[in-house]
Interface confidence: low
């Protein structure tokens, strides 16, 4: 009769997290007479991960009732399976002995490889507001896959970008990976209502990629342009001047007017008119009694927006 | 007959997201007839929020039936509110007028303020390992929390951490905000089991904060320390010398074997101990055929860890 | 401009098998996922499955799964489906579209072929 | 899988009358909607993307509204050529599923 031989059919063997692994083994003999165990790994460090004499392994199921007479049908189950799982397992003939049983044979192995799906990509811009012309970086990450393959792309209002630079970590093998990506954006006066988009595709994706979205109004700063001018007024002794806030973003504005440079009004813009590209205008009018006024008199609308240094326009109003 | 006043009994009313909101209004009149409106701000940019007299508000419920005769209260509901219905909302009455009805009065305001949970804490480690006794560095992001007032917190294995950099985005109002923190761990050899906590306590989380986790061992390198000995050996032509891979981190190790620099073997850890610490020990031999040497021969073990430059041991095997 | 120019008609009998052609034009071919969609003779759509020319990776319709199969060629710009153990009811226009590898949503189903008739009869 | 249900099946209207379709998904789709028009014996052709988004050269006329689960497809005032049948599809969620379709005849 021939020597057994311990028959692990498959190579490998790849199931998603969450899902059972079959691990398929079967003997050509029925002796000698001695228990089988499954182990990971091999050698000294191997982990037991199932024994049929013994113990108690709760996420193992046999496929087949091992104490059935004549069976040779040593197959497993591994239920719930995490990317911790993943490693090469061999299943192992015991020859019954005195005291311990001595190892006999043992398979060739399966790999079992774990699919685990990417996270939700979180994006993050940056911690400063940047003016249009300047570049902003931001960010992309994803944890968790498994294999490390994976595309990684960047858009803005579904244009695809190519400056950013990617990292896929650990470098080596490990049960699951995480992506990181580094994209810059040049900012123009027109990106309030801008977005960028961090699609990541994975095979445990099954073509419907992940996306996680930032948007460029929480990274820009649109300084707005002044013009001061005066209206037209029915009563002698008043003027009406008006200070017109073009095209700002964000909302935060302080408007201060001053007469020959000394602070005559300050005003917080509240009510604001959007504009279609996201920017907001804002108006300030000033009512001058020419009366109290001997001289032509300079009227400076002084404009501090989102906290930035302040801007200014003049205007010489003459007194006839 | 007294004026008619538009009464807004609250001042403010603060609402989670995701819930209605109530916001109450009450007329001290009949009279004049007309319609009332419900705006977010006020003057030429406000928001039209409800109409009573025409249009669909399929977010707005009215709280009392407003067509019925004597009505004066003319509160309404906004359901599933989001942080952008933050705002002051007026309630209005108009004057029945020809051909448009005429704004006669507005209630003082509302002011709703919107509380938004902040996402899961997303932390990210550094892209590139480190050895024990350098400065990584770890994000920790969350976003989309309102009110602003928000507290972040990093421990190491449950000890807090002190060297960290906090910034909540952006600097002036808005409807959410963000949170970006960046530690600074000191790494330790025995730190692959450690784990760094990011925890953010906010008014929503009613006293259960968010964590998010890293784990230390994506971003530690420990180097193998080597150590070669001769084994005894009962066959007297053979010599076996052991070379001792101790406590390193994370797997990925090439050993090779030179005899007087010339190379006698190369081998791939597999089957590695792990040690209490989470650091890996390997060993490997060389046996040495001394019949086929006539001097003295220098054995080095040379060992390449990670991707990084190889350390190498080296032991003088005398041929007596 | 994109265009999709499928294979012509095909008349076949019950049992056998039969290949459709889609070659692409105009755009980067495997920037897209190539999906297939079935229209019986008077009948609505149904959607067969896609493939990803960058790496053959597949998804299908569990009503399709040994039915189709998706292949392609890169270097020719064309995806194939072979359809087999053909039977009366697969008698249909098959017409394949394409969405674009990433989900934005102006590039999903904007090109289609002309159609290819399949009439399976002995 | 997402079923989509559209209704109605046919109906019959004039040149210049207002036409309603609409569609229901049987779980949330966000705004991943197609509306796609198929004349005899051609291909279909896409009107609408993400719901409302009107594809280019495509008249006014069409437009898209709806998310979540219901959806609706709307010609302001219908004209000679938009006699056809009009179909829903999902792209939220594989399998990709059409609605039964609405054949928009003359009255």
């Known amino acids: 009769e021939d020597e057994l031989q311990v028959i692990q059919p498959e190579k490998s063997v790849s199931v998603a997290a969450g899902e059972s692994a079959t691990l398929r083994c079967a003997m050509t003999s029925l002796i000698p007479v001695g228990p089988i165990m499954w182990f990971r790994g091999a050698g000294a460090g191997r982990e037991l991960i199932y024994n049929q004499k013994e113990g108690h392994f709760p996420r193992v199921t046999t496929v087949s009732e091992l104490t059935k007479r004549n069976n040779l049908d040593f197959s497993i189950s591994i239920s719930n399976i995490t990317p911790a799982d993943a490693g090469t397992y061999y299943c192992v003939k015991f020859r019954k002995g005195s005291p311990d049983d001595v190892e006999f044979k043992s398979g060739a192995g399966t790999e079992l490889s774990v699919r685990a799906k990417p996270s939700a990509p979180v994006v993050s811009g940056p911690a400063v507001r940047a003016t249009p012309e300047h570049t902003v970086s931001f960010t992309c990450e994803s944890h968790g896959f498994s294999p490390r393959d994976i595309t990684l792309k960047w858009f803005k209002n579904g244009n695809e970008l190519s400056d950013f630079q990617t990292n896929v970590d650990p470098a080596g093998d490990s049960v699951s990976y995480s992506i990181h990506s580094t994209a810059r954006v040049v900012l123009t006066r027109g990106d309030v209502h801008s977005q960028v988009i961090c699609e990541i595709a994975h095979i445990t994706l099954q073509g419907d990629p992940l996306r996680g979205t930032a948007n460029l109004s929480e990274a820009i700063r649109v300084p707005p342009t002044l013009e001061v001018t005066q209206q037209p007024m029915r009563a002698e002794n008043q003027a009406n001047v008006t200070c017109q806030v073009s095209n700002f973003y964000p909302r935060g504005l302080q408007l201060t007017w001053l007469e020959n440079g000394n602070v005559s009004r300050t005003e917080t813009a509240s009510t604001l008119i959007e504009n279609k590209d996201g920017t907001y205008n804002w108006m300030s009018w000033l009512l001058v009694n020419t009366c109290a006024h001997r001289d032509d008199v300079v009227l400076t609308c002084q404009v501090e927006h989102d906290g930035q240094q302040a801007v200014s326009k003049s205007y010489a109003l003459e007194i006839s | 007959e007294d004026e008619l006043q538009v009464i807004q009994p609250e001042k403010s009313v603060s609402v989670a997201a995701g819930e209605s909101a109530t916001l109450r209004c009450a007329m001290t009149s009949l009279i004049p007839v007309g319609p009332i409106m419900w705006f977010r701000g006020a003057g030429a940019g406000r928001e039209l929020i409800y109409n009573q007299k025409e249009g669909h508000f399929p977010r707005v419920t009215t709280v009392s039936e407003l067509t019925k005769r004597n009505n004066l209260d003319f509160s309404i509901s906004i359901s599933n509110i989001t942080p952008a219905d933050a705002g002051t909302y007026y309630c209005v009455k108009f004057r029945k007028g020809s051909p448009d009805d005429v704004e006669f009065k507005s209630g003082a305001g509302t002011e709703l303020s919107v509380r938004a949970k902040p996402s899961a804490p997303v932390v990210s480690g550094p892209a590139v390992r480190a050895t024990p006794e350098h400065t990584v560095s770890f994000t920790c992001e969350s976003h989309g929390f309102s009110p602003r007032d928000i507290t972040l917190k990093w421990f190491k294995n449950g000890n807090e951490l002190s060297d960290f950099q906090t910034n909540v985005d952006p600097a002036g109002d808005s409807v959410s905000y963000s949170i970006h923190s960046t530690a600074r761990v000191v790494l330790t050899r025995g730190d692959v089991h450690s784990q760094v906590i990011c925890e953010i306590a906010h008014i929503t989380l009613q006293g259960d904060p968010l964590r998010g986790t890293a784990n230390l061992s994506e971003a530690i390198r420990v180097p193998p320390t080597l150590e070669v000995t001769q084994q005894p050996m009962r066959a007297e032509n053979q010599a076996n010398v052991t070379c001792q891979v101790s406590n390193f981190y994370p797997r990925g190790l090439q050993l090779t074997w030179l005899e007087n620099g010339n190379v006698s073997r190369t081998e791939t850890a597999s089957t590695l101990i792990e040690n209490k610490d989470g650091t890996y020990n390997w060993m490997s031999w060389l046996l040495v055929n001394t019949c086929a040497h006539r001097d003295d021969v220098v054995l080095t073990c040379q060992v390449e860890h990670d991707g990084q430059q190889a350390v190498s041991k080296s032991y003088a095997l005398e041929i007596s | 401009e994109v265009q999709l120019v499928q294979s012509g008609a095909e008349v076949v009998k019950p049992g056998a098998s039969v290949k459709l052609s889609c070659k692409a034009s105009g755009s980067t071919f495997t920037s897209y996922w190539m999906h297939w969609v079935k229209q019986a003779p008077g009948q609505g759509l149904e959607w067969i499955g896609a493939i990803y020319p960058v790496n053959s990776d597949t998804t299908y319709n569990q009503k399709f799964k040994g039915k189709a199969t998706l292949t392609v060629d890169k270097s020719a710009s064309t995806a194939y489906m072979e359809l087999s153990s053909l039977r009366s009811e697969d008698t249909a226009v098959y017409y394949c579209?394409?969405?674009?590898?990433?989900?934005?949503?102006?590039?999903?189903?904007?090109?289609w072929g002309q159609g290819t008739l399949v009439t399976v009869s002995s | 899988d997402i079923q989509m249900t559209q209704s109605p099946s046919s109906l019959s209207a004039s040149v210049g009358d207002r036409v309603t379709i609409t569609c229901r998904a049987s779980q949330d789709i966000g705004s991943r909607l197609n509306w796609l028009q198929q004349k005899p014996g051609k291909a279909p052709k896409r009107l609408i993307y993400?719901?409302?988004s009107l594809d280019s050269g495509v008249p006014s006329r069409f437009s898209g509204s709806g998310s979540g689960t219901e959806f609706t497809l709307t010609i302001s005032s219908l004209q000679p050529e938009d006699f056809a049948t009009y179909y829903c599809l999902q792209y939220a969620s594989s399998p990709f599923t059409f609605g039964g379709g609405t054949k928009v005849e003359i009255k």
């Open positions: 993400a719901t409302s």
């Open positions: 579209t394409r969405s674009f590898y990433y989900s934005l949503d102006a590039a999903w189903f904007v090109y």
